[in-house]
Amino acid sequence: AVNGTSQFTCFYNSRANISCVWSQDGALQDTSCQVHAWPDRRRWNQTCELLPVSQASWACNLILGAPDSQKLTTVDIVTLRVLCREGVRWRVMAIQDFKPFENLRLMAPISLQVVHVETHRCNISWEISQASHYFERHLEFEARTLSPGHTWEEAPLLTLKQKQEWICLETLTPDTQYEFQVRVKPLQGEFTTWSPWSQPLAFRTKPAALGKDT
């Protein structure tokens, strides 16, 4: 038997993926464990094998279909179980009634690109990936810019309280290298959280014209 504190957390990406992390103090690394998904109103079940990500935590993705297919709705409830092999039997280690649209975490924004860059400003655009059409425009974004000599954690957060897939960064220093990241969150869902940060986009402001006041 496995003793200790257990935590089982899952998020729905709003389309066809439920990502789960199970942590259990004192669990055995070489035990085979599965996450089992049992929807209340669908004809499919889905499993994924939990793989170790640290000493006491495991993760897997329940892939419900093609990436952009809408596999669950706001009324669905999915019973999620962690089952681990004990000899020839399988023991339920954790269970939750999962409401997908109350536990959202979207994919990181993609396709970041510089639309226009000047000496002091830069216009950047991006796209959201695998986001449900149910949200319509009910999304918000956070962005941050990495300046020379600073860390991402020190970068101030810029909040876009609407579905706006671009930003104009102002008051930048001429001829300077920057990096930019953005993340997205639906407004819906009691336990909804921010997406991962996008891959950073590197850009450089244009140098100031010679003889001009900067």
Epitope: S32, Q34, H36, W44, N45, Q46, T47, C48, E49, L51, C60, I63, L64, G65, A66, P67, L83, W90
Partner: nanobody
Amino acid sequence: QVQLVESGGGLVQAGGSLRLSCVVSGDVFVRYTMAWFRQAPGKEREFVAVVTDSGRTTEYVDSVKGRFTVSRDNAKNTVYLQMNNLKPEDTAVYYCAANTDYFQIRSVDNNAWGQGTQVTVSS
């Protein structure tokens, strides 16, 4: 709908080897737990081996343990059954099976199936 196509069967002498392949199309391959079954003439279809979605865990029927190895290549949408030290009693049609539910795949009812490939082991 998911489609499965097996290949690699044939006639082999006892003690020989064969490698079966099963290519999956029509859906996201990594959704599926994959298994091999076999059916000898006049007998029921029996479970041979299973491999989880990640490929990390495999299981076998006792009669093939140590001789057969199941594996998968998620980049190629393919599952394999490497069969060594074949015996005449391994003669059967070998079927590839797919199920999104690991816990259902051994019961044949809800699986997706290939058309099968004949393996004949002569003594």
